[in-house]
């Protein structure tokens, strides 16, 4: 906490400029008007303030806006955002995607911090759902964002937003998350033709039930082993040897390399040896 001291004569700041970097902390506190700072926040990032000086500027804004900063200030926080705590951010009402982008840019290249997580949470809750533009933005900055959401949070994602999801965005999703996302993807892509549909739905198939896998096996999709390995065990077990052969097409030979791994191992165990022998891969049930 900076002590309240009178501003020395001639030092009162008329605008936010580089001369302020020579001010001591107490001088910044005494000589910079909080309202001036708020209106000229966009200039702060162009000035090489020390961390200590930024602390003073934050303190001034906190005094001016005890109930939380207005969006006009938030949008121009820049590196001052890194000084904010999750508690500070919970007081904000961020509605503009441009504001969100500006703040995410500050944290770019770093892992998602508690501050960023809180900011995103506030933004998404404010919007009521995770719309396509928001999802586009968030996954661009954090490819793993979608998989950081709980199944309950994912349930608010409208099917239309699924078009924004790239395969790499689902890399770290667990089965419970894919269980929620798969029906949305199925709905989003339902009007596509066979081969195009499979390309789009492939990344989501970790949430697919047996019936859908059986249907896909009738469409010559040639599923690769990497996708097959991500399928739900309970969805794979009821598939017949013939259905798996059709589903994988030329990739069926890859089962041999995965015979000790789930879900392939579980599936093999539950097949008749005579049926497995038809594959000619030497799989032992």
């Amino acid at each position: 906490e900076v002590e309240k001291t009178a501003c020395p004569s001639g030092k009162k700041a008329r605008e936010i400029d580089e001369s302020l970097i020579f001010y001591k902390k107490w001088e910044l506190e005494a000589c910079v008007d909080a309202a001036l700072l708020a209106t000229q926040m966009d200039r702060v990032n162009a000035i090489p303030f020390t961390y200590e000086q930024l602390d003073v500027l934050k303190h001034k804004l906190d005094e001016l806006y005890p109930q939380g900063y207005p969006e006009s200030v938030i949008q121009h926080l820049g590196y001052l955002f890194l000084k904010m705590s999750p508690e500070d951010i919970r007081k904000w009402n961020v509605t503009s995607l441009e504001t969100l982008k500006a703040l995410l840019e500050v944290n770019k290249g770093h892992e998602m911090s508690p501050q960023v997580a809180t900011l995103i949470d506030r933004f998404v809750k404010g919007r009521g759902q995770l719309d396509k533009d928001t999802l586009d933005t968030l996954t661009a900055f954090y490819p793993g964002y979608l998989c950081s959401l709980s199944p309950e949070e994912l349930s608010s994602v409208p099917p239309s937003s699924i078009w924004a999801v790239r395969p790499q965005d689902l890399d770290t999703c667990d089965p419970r998350q894919l269980d929620v996302l798969y029906p949305k993807a199925r709905l989003a892509f339902q009007n596509m033709n066979g081969s195009e549909y499979f390309v789009k739905i492939q990344s989501f198939l970790g949430g697919a039930p047996t019936e859908d896998l059986k249907a896909l096996s009738q469409q010559n999709v040639s599923m690769d082993l990497a996708t097959f390995m991500k399928l739900r065990t309970d969805a794979v077990l009821p598939l017949t040897v013939a259905e798996v052969q059709k589903l994988l097409g030329p990739h069926v030979e890859g089962l041999k390399a995965e015979e000790r791994h789930r879900p392939v191992r579980d599936w093999i165990l539950r097949q008749r040896q005579d049926d497995l022998d038809t594959l000619g891969l030497g799989l032992q049930g």
Epitope: D174, P175, R176, M229, K230, T233, D234, L237, R260, H261, R262, R265, D266, L269, R270, Q284, G285
Partner: antibody
């Protein structure tokens, strides 16, 4: 609900064969989703999986124990058994039988039986 | 074989504390990771399966996360009955392996 109970001698001499049986009650050893495992825990140490059997008779063993282990199943008695040959003091442990549900994990365990290898 | 490395091997905590235990696989195991709790003289009990799914009857203060090689078990608010040893286990590869265990003791 399904319960498991281990039985067998608590003392085995070095170089002999350890034999244990697990009796399944309240359910069938022929369950589609279940495999039946043996897991052991030496005193004061961690858990070591020994192997499993499916009701069809298919088995899978821990590679480090494979040469000494045989697991069998008797569907008529609703039991499965473990034989571990050429035992040494290093095989002294609490031996557990457990059900593994293919969709979850080792969800049901016996209470364990202490087997000491000593002359 | 896939090696499972748990850390820490032991920890001291107080009732009400948030406790985090990590488990690392020597190669990717997708989401095939289970967590067990074992109390002295008792058989282990399944807490979490498939990395993040809560086994029926297990309190919601237990949660799991992770995929690939890095996994976490979290107890949001430690209760007196939670002082025990926790093991991770991979059922992905046929040579099922357990982590070395993490003993959670009273501070």
């Amino acid at each position: 609900q399904v319960q498991l109970q281990e039985s067998g001698p608590g003392l085995v001499k070095p170089s002999e064969t350890l034999s244990l049986t697990c009796t399944v009650s309240g359910g069938s050893v022929s369950s589609y989703y279940s495999t039946w495992s043996w897991i052991r825990q030496p005193p004061g140490k961690g858990l070591e999986w020994i192997g499993y059997i499916y009701y069809s008779g298919s088995t899978n063993y821990n590679p480090s124990l494979k040469s000494r282990v045989t697991i069998s199943v008797d569907t008529s008695k609703n039991q499965f058994s473990l034989k571990l040959s050429s035992v040494t003091a290093a095989d002294t442990a609490v031996y557990y039988c457990a059900r593994e549900d293919a969709l979850t994990g080792f969800d049901i365990w016996g209470q364990g039986t202490m087997v000491t290898v000593s002359s | 074989d896939i090696q499972m490395t748990q850390s820490p091997s032991s920890l001291s905590a107080s009732v009400g504390d948030r406790v985090t235990i990590t488990c690392r696989a020597s190669q990717s195991i997708s989401s095939y990771l289970n967590w067990y709790q074992q109390k002295p003289g008792k058989a282990p009990k399944l807490l979490i399966y498939a990395a993040s799914s809560l086994q029926s009857g297990v309190p919601s203060r237990f949660s799991g996360s992770g995929s690939g090689t890095d996994f976490t078990l979290t107890i949001s608010s430690l209760q007196p009955e939670d002082f025990a040893t926790y093991y991770c286990q991979q059922p992905y590869d046929a040579s099922y392996t357990f982590g070395g265990g993490t003993k959670v003791e009273i501070k």
